[in-house]
């Protein structure tokens, strides 16, 4: 056939898998009548008629393209739908009149691969291997044509390097005609590669140009021998009794050796192994001063049976001992003096403070508190606080009760209690003194005594309100070896006008509590009560 020797290069049509390829017949009017054209596919130099155009009407030939071809653009263009990788071939159109001419189209098909999947070698790599070991495998599925793979370490592309880096790639053709690429990176790694980030990149082409997809970054377990073991203590900084302290062994090898933690026995100077938890951590909770001492860690490589010892580490658990106050239970006459001395031991410099227990008032900064010309009111609690200023929260305290000898001191001298006849009245009377007083009542009833503290007692009396009781009132008498004192409770019948708005007519009248510093009780109705005072 004339002209076959120098055929022009075919026209290139690029299309993605699954889309429609528009094959435009490029014959000029002089070369043939487009209303009479045959379309062929060429595969392995074999032509197959796939479509014919007659008087502008198209007709598919039976075969693989039968359902996917149609005519467009007034017969000049053949549309091929649902393009597959197998469609990558030459298509040609051949005009029949006036003489037989043909026009060739090269169809190129593309498909972006899926995101590359990278899998690190889970077994890890020893640094002392003789040849490159498998680091990771990269798989790019369903691409077309075969994408190119580039491996990166810490953002830099890796090149083949004899005995150091080897990249082994292979591909498989899926039934769809798409390619799955598998690339294995093999390398000889060094200890510094334990933190190295590896990833693979797939480079591929689409009709729109060149593209690439990156895998996630992975690190590979790198195994290297331990050269050094050491101890780490948490929390860092000053430790105090009561803290949770963790002592752990660390090593610069992977896998880490088998650890054991020992503490030097101060008496024998021998190292005694401590019991660690499942993670090999020695937990001191709560830390005590006895935990102070010299600790060291031993790391045993179970493969080589080589043992390494850490530098010893001194642990100091700061403490404040029990605080001792002397005298511990002071008893003094009114008018006398008292010196309270506070003592404690600590691993650090101590500061002492004396506070009045009842008020929290700071009385003295220092270990010695001097009290002069003691009055009865000076009796009660004094607290010594021993603290380490350099370690917040490290302190101990001791309360000492100062007893001032004296006859009972009544919480109130006299009190009015509103009552109803025939009700059961609950009366209470409180007294303090040293020695601790006992309380008696001048009427029959059920009395019970409660010790409030070493110098204070509260007596409660349940009594029925009778006309005689209303007339006489009730007296409570507190006595000790130094004297006695009496409080009087005047009983007054209640009527509606004497009730306060928030009083309860039943329970509100069943109880009267006479106690120091509480002139009115929520469960009694009282009027113009005197301040608490002594009947000394």
């Amino acid at each position: 056939v004339p002209g076959e020797a120098e055929q022009p290069a075919p026209e290139l049509v690029e299309v993605e898998v699954g889309s429609t390829a528009l094959l435009k017949c490029g014959l000029s009017q002089s070369q043939g009548n487009l209303s009479h054209v045959d379309w062929f596919s060429v595969h392995k130099e074999k032509r197959t008629l796939i479509f014919r155009v007659r008087q502008g009407q198209g007709q598919s030939e039976p075969g693989e393209y039968e359902q996917r071809l149609s005519l467009q653009d007034r017969g000049a263009t053949l549309a091929l739908t649902q393009v597959t990788p197998q469609d990558e071939r030459i298509f040609l159109c051949q005009g029949k009149r006036p003489r037989s001419q043909e026009y060739r189209i090269q169809l190129r098909v593309y498909k972006a691969p899926e995101e590359p999947n990278i899998q690190v070698n889970p077994l890890g790599i020893p640094v002392n291997s003789k040849e490159p070991e498998e680091v990771a495998t990269c798989v790019g599925r369903n691409g077309y044509p075969i994408p190119q793979v580039i491996w990166y370490k810490n953002g830099r592309p890796l090149k083949e390097e004899k005995n150091r880096v080897h990249i082994q790639s292979s591909q498989t053709v899926e039934s769809s005609g798409l390619y799955t690429l598998q690339s294995i990176l093999k390398a000889q790694l060094v200890k510094e590669d334990k933190d190295a980030q590896f990833y693979c990149e797939l480079n591929y082409r689409l009709p729109s140009g060149n593209h690439m997809k990156e895998s996630r970054e992975v690190t590979v377990p790198v195994f290297y021998p331990t050269e050094k073991v050491w101890l780490e203590v948490e929390p860092v900084g000053m430790l105090k009794e009561g803290d949770r302290v963790e002592i752990r062994c660390l090593a610069d090898g992977n896998p880490p050796p088998h650890f054991s933690i020992s503490k030097q026995n101060p008496s024998t100077r021998e190292a005694e192994e401590e019991t660690t938890n499942d993670n090999g951590v020695l937990v001191l909770e709560p830390a005590r001063k006895e935990h102070s001492g010299r600790y060291e860690c031993q790391g045993l490589d179970l493969d080589t049976m080589i043992s390494l010892l850490s530098e010893p580490q001194e642990l100091l658990v700061n403490y404040v001992s029990d605080v001792r106050v002397s005298p511990a239970a002071p008893e003094r006459q009114e008018g006398s003096s008292l010196t309270l001395t506070c003592e404690a031991e600590s691993s650090q410099d101590l500061e002492f403070q004396w506070l009045r227990e009842e008020t929290g008032q700071v009385l003295e900064r220092g270990p010695v508190l001097q009290l002069h010309d003691l009055k009865r009111e000076a009796g009660g609690g004094y607290r010594c606080v021993a603290s380490v200023p350099s370690i917040p929260g490290l302190n101990r305290t001791q309360l000492v009760n100062v007893a001032i000898f004296g006859p009972p001191w009544m919480a109130f001298k006299e009190r009015k209690v509103w009552v109803k006849e025939n009700m059961v009245l609950n009366l209470s009377c409180e007294a303090s003194g040293h020695p601790r007083p006992t309380i008696s009542w001048n009427v029959n009833g059920t009395a019970s005594e409660q010790d409030q503290d070493p110098q204070r007692v509260l007596s409660t009396l349940n009594v029925l309100v009778t006309p005689e009781l209303l007339e006489t009132g009730v007296e409570c008498t507190a006595s000790n070896d130094l004297g006695k004192n009496t409080s009087i409770l005047f009983l007054e019948l209640v009527n509606l006008t004497t009730l306060t708005p928030d009083s309860n007519t039943t329970t509100g009248l069943s109880t009267s509590t006479a106690s120091p510093h509480t002139r009115a009780n929520s469960t009694s109705t009282e009027r113009k009560l005197p301040e608490p005072e002594s009947r000394g």
Epitope: A329, E331, Q333, A403, F405, R436, D453, P454, D481, G483
Partner: antibody, heavy 118, light 111 residues
Framework: QVQLVESGGGVVQPGRSLRLSCAAS????????IHWVRQAPGKGLEWVAR????????YYNEKFKGRFTISRDNSKNTLYLQMNSLRAEDTAVYYC???????????WGAGTMVTVSS | ELVMTQSPSSLSASVGDRVTITCRAS??????????MHWYQQKPGKAPKLLIY???NLESGVPARFSGSGSGTDFTLTISSLQPEDFATYYC?????????FGQGTKLEIK
């Protein structure tokens, strides 16, 4: 220094009486409680009675009420235990001891031996 | 009356030993933080000597190897490291109420 010294012990016939003395020195007599505690041979300690010299208030172990009387002479800083109707089982070393208001005995005398025997 | 039961009645130990004597009261002898329990040491032919007052306070001049603890009804006297001069009889005493009573004593002998 603070001291308590008992005297007046000896051998006495059953049914007879005996008065023990306890001389105090080195502290303000009227500011402390003075007690009598006894100990039968080879036995334990038994509290008998107490007095507060400042107010002359006394308390007794019920076991000795009526037979024993505790008293004091502030001018002499001396405490006494008058024991009547003595029995063989009253044979013991009698100690006087001092206390504050928490009733622990911080100072003891050396004791005086009373033997009731016919 | 409040009964004090001491145990053991007697005890053999060696110099340097740690010794514990217990005392149980038939009812609580504690009042809001104060335990009215005291310990005494008595040597043959001598008067008792106060060691510990109010359960845990060391009397002035008593060696620190003596210590007391407890509250409510159960109390202990501990000698951390026995010395030759510690072989004696030990008594507990309560002062919670009248009459004050003593334990029957614990005789500490040399093994």
């Amino acid at each position: 220094q603070v001291q308590l010294v008992e005297s007046g012990g000896g051998v006495v016939q059953p049914g007879r009486s005996l008065r023990l003395s306890c001389a105090a020195s080195g502290f303000t007599f009227s500011n402390y409680w003075i007690h009598w505690v006894r100990q039968a041979p080879g036995k334990g300690l038994e509290w008998v009675a107490r007095i507060y010299p400042g107010t002359d208030i006394t308390y007794y172990n019920e076991k000795f009420k009526g037979r024993f009387t505790i008293s004091r002479d502030n001018s002499k800083n001396t405490l006494y235990l008058q024991m009547n109707s003595l029995r063989a089982e009253d044979t013991a070393v009698y100690y006087c001891a001092r206390s504050g208001g928490y009733w622990y005995f911080d100072v003891w005398g050396a004791g005086t031996m009373v033997t009731v025997s016919s | 009356e409040l009964v004090m039961t001491q145990s053991p009645s007697s005890l053999s130990a060696s110099v340097g030993d740690r010794v514990t004597i217990t005392c149980r009261a038939s009812k609580s002898v504690s009042i809001s933080g104060y335990s009215y329990m005291h310990w005494y040491q008595q040597k043959p032919g001598k008067a008792p000597k106060l060691l510990i007052y109010l359960a845990s306070n060391l009397e002035s001049g008593v060696p620190a190897r003596f210590s007391g603890s407890g509250s409510g009804t159960d109390f202990t006297l501990t000698i951390s490291s026995l010395q030759p001069e510690d072989f004696a009889t030990y008594y507990c005493q309560h002062s919670r109420e009248l009459p004050y009573t003593f334990g029957q004593g614990t005789k500490l002998e040399i093994k």
